[in-house]
C-alpha cells in the first residue's frame, strides 16, 4: 500500500524558518503534490503550494520555496514573518496524486517540545486517504 510521510523541521539558525518535507512511498508515477496547512486539502486546509513534476512548482506566502528533492519527495520552506510562531502548532498536510493509485494524503506537525534543528518523526498522522 502506498504511504505518504511528512516531516516538519525548525531551522536551527533561524527560529522563524520552517521546512516541511514530504515523500511518497509506493509504485506509480506522481502527477501532482499539494501542500496545505491547518488540515487536509478540501477539509479545512489552505493550500500553500502545488508541485507538478514537469509543469513546475508554485507557492504562496508564508511559503517561500517549494521544490522537488527527488522524483518522489518534495520540500517547502516557510518564513514566519510574525512576532509569534504560528507554525509551531500547525498541522501541515501533503497530498500526492499518483497514477494509477489515486490520491494519498498524510499530515504532520512540529512536536511541541522540538528544539531548533530537530524534526518531527516521519510517522504520518493517520489521515491516510485514498481518493
Amino acid at each position: 500500500t502506498p504511504e505518504v510521510w511528512v516531516q516538519v523541521q525548525m531551522e536551527a539558525t533561524e527560529l522563524s524558518s520552517f521546512t516541511v518535507h514530504c515523500g511518497f512511498l509506493g509504485p506509480g508515477s506522481i502527477s501532482l503534490v499539494t501542500v496545505s496547512w491547518g488540515g487536509p486539502d478540501g477539509a479545512g486546509g489552505t493550500k500553500l503550494a502545488v508541485l507538478h513534476p514537469e509543469l513546475g512548482t508554485r507557492q504562496w506566502a508564508p511559503a517561500r520555496q517549494a521544490r522537488w528533492e527527488t522524483q518522489s519527495s518534495i520540500s517547502l520552506a516557510l518564513e514566519d514573518s510574525g512576532a509569534s510562531s504560528p507554525f509551531a502548532n500547525t498541522t501541515f498536510c501533503c497530498k500526492f496524486a499518483s497514477f494509477p493509485e489515486g490520491s494519498w494524503e498524510s499530515c504532520g506537525s512540529l512536536p511541541p517540545s522540538s528544539d531548533p534543528g530537530l524534526s518531527a518523526p516521519p510517522t504520518p498522522v493517520p489521515i491516510l486517504r485514498a481518493d
Epitope: 478540501g42 489552505t46 493550500k47 502545488v50 507538478h52 513534476p53 514537469e54 509543469l55 513546475g56 508554485r58 504562496w60 506566502a61 521544490r67 522537488w68 528533492e69 527527488t70 522524483q71 518534495i74
Partner: antibody, heavy 114, light 113 residues
Framework: EVQLQQSGPEVVKPGASVKISCKAS????????INWVKQSHGKSLEWIGD????????NYNQKFKGKATLTVDKSSGTAFMGLRSLTSEDSAVYYC???????WGQGTSLTVSS | DIVMTQSPSSLSVSAGEKVTMSCKSS????????????LAWYQQKPGQPPKLLIY???TRESGVPDRFTGSGSGTDFTLTISSVQAEDLAVYYC?????????FGGGTRLEIK
C-alpha cells in the same frame, strides 16, 4: 471541461482604473489558481501574477506591482484583476489562465485612449 | 529574471515540410531534484488565446498531434513540427516555467507558403 469566461472589452481614459473578471467553471473553484497574462498588440506574452483562491495569496511579477491588483470572490467563483493609473502602455489583451496555463480565457481587450 | 530568446522570429515553409525552432534561456531550467526541465511551448493562432502544446520540454499535452516534438535540456530547447499542415499557421512561444516571473520568449511566427 474547465472553462474561463472573461469580461468584455474596455475603453477607458488615461489615469482611470479598470477591473477585469474571469469566471471559472467545470471544477471546484478552490482548485483554480489563476494566472494573468498581458499581450500588447502584435507582441509577446508577459506574466502579471497569480492568485490562490484558497486564501487570496498572490505572487506578482515585480514589473506589475503597483499596477495590477489580483483578487478572488470564492462565492461566485470569479477572479479579478484591477489595473490603475492607466496609460496607453496598458492597452493590450489581458488573459486569465489556470495554474499551469493549460486552460485560457478568451481574453479581454483594454484600450486606453483620451 | 530569466530571459527567453527564440529564433528565428519568423519562417515560411510549404505544407509537408519539417520545421525546427529554437528557444534559449539565460539560466538553466533543469530542476536538479527530479531531473525535469521546466519549459513549455505554446501555439497561438490568429485571434485566439495561446494553447499549451508541450511541457516539461518534451511531454505533449493531451490532444496535441504527434507531429509536434519538444526536445532539449538546461538552456537550449527545440520545437520540431515533422510535417507542417496548413492549420499550424500560428505564433509559437516558449516559456520559462522554472521560476517567477514566468517569462515567455518573443515568439516564432510560422507562415505557410
Amino acid at each position: 471541461e474547465v472553462q474561463l469566461q472573461q469580461s468584455g472589452p474596455e475603453v477607458v481614459k488615461p489615469g482611470a482604473s479598470v477591473k477585469i473578471s474571469c469566471k471559472a467553471s467545470g471544477n471546484t473553484f478552490t482548485d483554480y489558481f489563476i494566472n494573468w497574462v498581458k499581450q500588447s498588440h502584435g507582441k509577446s506574452l508577459e506574466w502579471i501574477g497569480d492568485i490562490n483562491p484558497d486564501n487570496g495569496g498572490t505572487n506578482y511579477n515585480q514589473k506589475f506591482k503597483g499596477k495590477a491588483t489580483l483578487t478572488v470572490d470564492k462565492s461566485s467563483g470569479t477572479a479579478f484583476m484591477g489595473l490603475r493609473s492607466l496609460t496607453s502602455e496598458d492597452s493590450a489583451v489581458y488573459y486569465c489562465a489556470t495554474l499551469y496555463f493549460d486552460y485560457w480565457g478568451q481574453g479581454t481587450s483594454l484600450t486606453v485612449s483620451s | 529574471d530569466i530571459v527567453m530568446t527564440q529564433s528565428p522570429s519568423s519562417l515560411s515553409v510549404s505544407a509537408g515540410e519539417k520545421v525546427t525552432m529554437s528557444c534559449k534561456s539565460s539560466q538553466s531550467l533543469l530542476n536538479s531534484g527530479n531531473q525535469k526541465n521546466y519549459l513549455a511551448w505554446y501555439q497561438q493562432k490568429p485571434g485566439q488565446p495561446p494553447k499549451l502544446l508541450i511541457y516539461g520540454a518534451s511531454t505533449r499535452e493531451s490532444g496535441v498531434p504527434d507531429r509536434f516534438t519538444g526536445s532539449g535540456s538546461g538552456t537550449d530547447f527545440t520545437l520540431t513540427i515533422s510535417s507542417v499542415q496548413a492549420e499550424d499557421l500560428a505564433v509559437y512561444y516558449c516559456q520559462n516555467a522554472h521560476s517567477s516571473p514566468y517569462t515567455f520568449g518573443g515568439g516564432t511566427r510560422l507562415e505557410i507558403k
